[in-house]
């Protein structure tokens, strides 16, 4: 069985302020089981943008229906983009663990840049 890969096809995305940004991410396998999360930035100070398991993320919607048992598409859309949202976004697969899930593999990242709102 081929090891799971996390694919973020776009290295960069540019969005006008006030619009929605779609950040694409796909897995090549469902195994190992465990949640996916999106972060802005890397390292200890990274900011959680979306957690498949839990939490309330009012500006984030998933592009695909994550309750499908065979879903491999973990793309997200972030609404009402502002300049403060600029940064590099990482789609990260975790494998289940106890008590805490363990980071398994990260995508290469997608840099989001924010253009000024057209006047």
């Amino acid at each position: 069985e081929d090891e799971l890969q996390v694919i973020q096809p776009e290295k960069s995305v540019s969005v006008a302020a006030g619009e929605s940004a779609t950040l694409r991410c796909a897995m090549t396998s469902l195994i190992p089981v465990g949640p996916i999360m999106w972060f802005r930035g890397a390292g200890a100070g990274r900011e959680l943008i979306y957690n498949q398991k839990e939490g309330h993320f009012p500006r984030v919607t998933t592009v695909s229906e994550l309750t499908k048992r065979n879903n491999l598409d973990f793309s997200i859309s972030i609404s009402n983009i502002t300049p403060a949202d600029a940064g590099t976004y990482y789609c990260v697969k975790f494998r289940k663990g106890s008590p805490d899930d363990v980071e398994f593999k990260s995508g290469a990242g997608t840099e989001l840049s924010v253009r000024a709102k057209p006047s």
């Epitope: 195994i31 949640p35 398991k53 839990e54 229906e65 309750t67 499908k68 048992r69 289940k96």
Partner: antibody, heavy 118, light 107 residues
Framework: DVQLVESGGGVVRPGESLRLSCAAS????????MSWVRQAPGKGLEWLAG????????YYIDSVKGRFTISRDNSKNSLYLQMNSLTAEDTAVYYC???????????WGLGTLVTVSS | ALTQPASVSANPGETVKITCSGG??????YGWYQQKSPGSAPVTVI????KRPSDIPSRFSGSASGSAATLTITGVRVEDEAVYYC???????????FGAGTTLTVL
């Protein structure tokens, strides 16, 4: 509070059909996958079928594939199980259950009894 | 198939462990369900291997390693008498499977 209430059970003859319903309240029904689980008299729990939140994807155990159909109407907060060609082995209490993000179960209904007898 | 003992017994206050084996750790999540009488509604005591719903007492805990999951009841009480079913969700097959159930008797 999350509530799941099954209905539609009863006594039917072998070969007949029955449609079970599950009315959901207390949560955003359209955001959750759902399942049907049954328990035959004196036996354990048996998962039968699951359906994604939007209703486009369905999953079954082999023993009911082709005879049972799971469906949902999110506008009515309702889950259904259409059961055809029933046999005595389908006699059981049928439960609907809400799925967690990883397709286990967190909330259960009280169940509805289906008896298949000639 | 998931395998669990048919019965376990304990005195009040003791610690009870119920095991459930047969799943692949990399592809399976486990849950535990309590049923106090046949035909009554099951109650989820653990899901996602070790997650306890907020209304379940803290004496219930779950863990998983290798090909097995364990339900632990620390300081068992008379009201914990029930049948406990383990269940697994397999991410390879998309199928849920239940164990045959373990009858817990509190002496």
């Amino acid at each position: 509070d999350v509530q799941l209430v099954e209905s539609g059970g009863g006594v039917v003859r072998p070969g007949e059909s029955l449609r079970l319903s599950c009315a959901a309240s207390g949560f955003t029904f359209s955001s959750y996958a759902m399942s049907w689980v049954r328990q035959a008299p004196g036996k354990g729990l048996e998962w039968l079928a699951g359906i994604s939140a939007g209703g486009s994807d369905t999953y079954y155990i082999d023993s009911v594939k082709g005879r049972f159909t799971i469906s949902r109407d999110n506008s009515k907060n309702s889950l259904y199980l259409q059961m055809n060609s029933l046999t005595a082995e389908d006699t059981a209490v049928y439960y609907c259950a809400r799925e967690t993000w990883n397709h286990l179960f967190d909330y259960w209904g009280l169940g509805t009894l289906v008896t298949v007898s000639s | 198939a998931l395998t669990q003992p048919a019965s376990v017994s304990a005195n009040p206050g003791e610690t009870v462990k119920i095991t459930c084996s047969g799943g692949d750790w990399y592809s399976t999540y486990y849950g535990w369900y309590q049923q106090k009488s046949p035909g009554s509604a099951p109650v989820t005591v653990i899901h996602s291997d070790d997650k306890r719903p907020s209304d379940i007492p803290s004496r219930f805990s779950g863990s998983a390693s290798g090909s097995a999951a364990t339900l632990t009841i620390t300081g068992v009480r008379v009201e914990d008498e029930a049948v406990y079913y383990c269940a697994g969700y397999d991410g390879r097959t998309y199928i849920n499977t239940f164990g045959a159930g373990t009858t817990l008797t509190v002496l």
